[in-house]
């Protein structure tokens, strides 16, 4: 028996369902009574789901997993993981035994898009060219940690005097706060780009200072 899984990681959005694909080639005359299928976490060996002795033994992992029972006899040993959480991320091993045994591991990469950044300015009034201002770009509820880039109105990267902090909430999702300290010119636009490296998703925010008032 040869077990096959996708070599590329499976990318799943938080709160959606993911399918970890695994297949084997049944011999002629194969019946499910002969099959032992075990899904487990690769690193800790924690049991996730099993099918043994002709029976689906059910989920051993938060009751959020399921097999595709009608497809098992065709060699489809894929696992459905429902309502994906950040903590589900990692490597899963699909182990199949019939006459022989084999196993293969598939990686699950969890992702969540970042919200459109909100921009705040401090101070936010009586601004004059030459003033030092603090611009804060905040984006929420993303995963994994974001990459943050600042640019001026001409698209020139601003790398100095940038402080970025990312904090995970109780669900493991990150809120990102990036602070740019800059000396105001006569007028200008300052834009912040928050990138999710897994989804290759960019969220943009900008602030334009043209005397008074400010536009966001």
């Amino acid at each position: 028996v040869e077990v096959q899984v996708s070599e590329d990681p499976v990318v799943a959005l938080v709160d959606t369902d993911a399918t970890l694909r695994c297949s084997f080639s049944p011999e002629p005359g194969f019946s499910l009574a002969q099959l032992n299928l075990i899904w487990q976490l690769t690193d800790t060996k924690q049991l996730v789901h099993s099918f043994t002795e002709g029976r689906d033994q059910g989920s051993a992992y938060s009751n959020r997993t399921a097999l595709f029972p009608d497809l098992l006899v065709q060699g489809n040993a894929s696992l459905r993981l429902q309502r994906v959480r950040v903590t589900d991320e990692g490597s899963y091993t699909c182990f199949v035994s019939i006459q022989d045994f084999d196993s293969a591991a598939v990686s699950l990469q969890v992702a969540a898009p970042y919200s459109k950044p909100s921009m705040t300015l401090e101070p936010n009034k009586d601004l004059r060219p030459g003033n030092m201002v603090t611009i804060t770009c905040s984006s929420y509820q993303g995963y994994p940690e974001a990459e943050v880039f600042w640019k001026d109105g001409q698209g020139v990267p601003l790398t100095g005097n940038v402080t970025t902090s990312q904090m995970a909430n109780e669900r493991g999702l990150f809120d990102v706060h990036s602070v740019l300290r800059v000396v105001l010119g006569a007028n200008g636009t300052y834009s912040c780009l928050v990138r999710n490296p897994v989804l290759q998703q960019d969220a943009h925010g900008s602030v334009t200072i043209t005397g008074q008032p400010l536009t966001f």
Partner: antibody
Framework: EVQLLESGGGLVQPGGSLRLSCAAS????????MTWVRQAPGKGLEWVAD????????LYADAVKGRFTISRDNSKNIVYLQMNSLRGEDTAVYYC?????????????WGQGTTVTVSS | QSVLTQPPSASGTPGQRVTISCSGV????????VHWYQQLPGTAPKLLIY???ERPSGVPDRFSGSTSGTSASLAISGLQSEDEADYYC???????????FGGGTKLTVL
């Protein structure tokens, strides 16, 4: 007649290495997963490692993981157990065994065993 | 990890029926299959019963296996002196813990 014959046991110092061999005959060796089981003096049976028919997938007991390596040569009908970083608690008779037609049904043919003694 | 518990010893007289228990058959993977091995003094183990009650060819029908709940039993009827041996139950824990053996029961024929 189906037969398994182990060899390679002996006396080795702690930290040393040894390679056990198990020569198979009388069955289609390349179609069956193989197992090593050990038995310390006066103790019970303890599973050590499994290898599937093609040799590409292996399983190990936690007690030997990272120190022992199971492998096979289907052209020679031999299964090996490479044992490194040996400890006193590895002292045992080592048996190789062939599985029934279904892997999870148990081991139906066993070798006579080879003795490994780890001592300084 | 599964721990299969067997009595360390059992005994009987020739012709008698003896039973050896194996408790703790609560596999995480859902497997309830138990296999039994006989090890005569100074020899390698031999498969006696597989899948709870099936006998490999060559094993006399005096040997029988059964299961109930989380326990398995090996029964030997018409006990003979050549049955004096160590008996081990075993179960398969898949990729999690591999093969798990009971501690063994030494059967003495009085």
């Amino acid at each position: 007649e189906v037969q398994l014959l182990e060899s390679g046991g002996g006396l080795v110092q702690p930290g040393g290495s040894l390679r056990l061999s198990c020569a198979a005959s009388g069955f289609t060796f390349s179609s069956y997963p193989m197992t090593w089981v050990r038995q310390a003096p006066g103790k019970g049976l303890e599973w050590v490692a499994d290898i599937n028919s093609g040799g590409g997938t292996t399983l190990y007991a936690d007690a030997v993981k990272g120190r022992f390596t199971i492998s096979r040569d289907n052209s020679k009908n031999i299964v090996y157990l490479q044992m490194n970083s040996l400890r006193g608690e590895d002292t045992a008779v080592y048996y190789c065994a062939k599985h029934l037609d279904y892997y999870s049904y148990g081991m139906d043919v066993w070798g006579q065993g080879t003795t490994v003694t780890v001592s300084s | 990890q599964s721990v299969l518990t067997q009595p360390p010893s059992a005994s009987g007289t020739p012709g008698q029926r003896v039973t050896i228990s194996c408790s703790g058959v609560t596999s995480k993977i859902g497997s309830k299959y138990v296999h039994w091995y006989q090890q005569l003094p100074g020899t390698a183990p031999k498969l006696l019963i597989y899948r709870n009650f099936e006998r490999p060819s060559g094993v006399p029908d005096r040997f029988s296996g059964s299961t109930s709940g989380t326990s398995a039993s090996l029964a030997i009827s018409g006990l003979q002196s050549e049955d004096e041996a160590d008996y081990y139950c075993a179960t398969w824990e898949g990729a999690l813990n591999g093969w798990v053996f009971g501690g063994g029961t030494k059967l003495t024929v009085l």
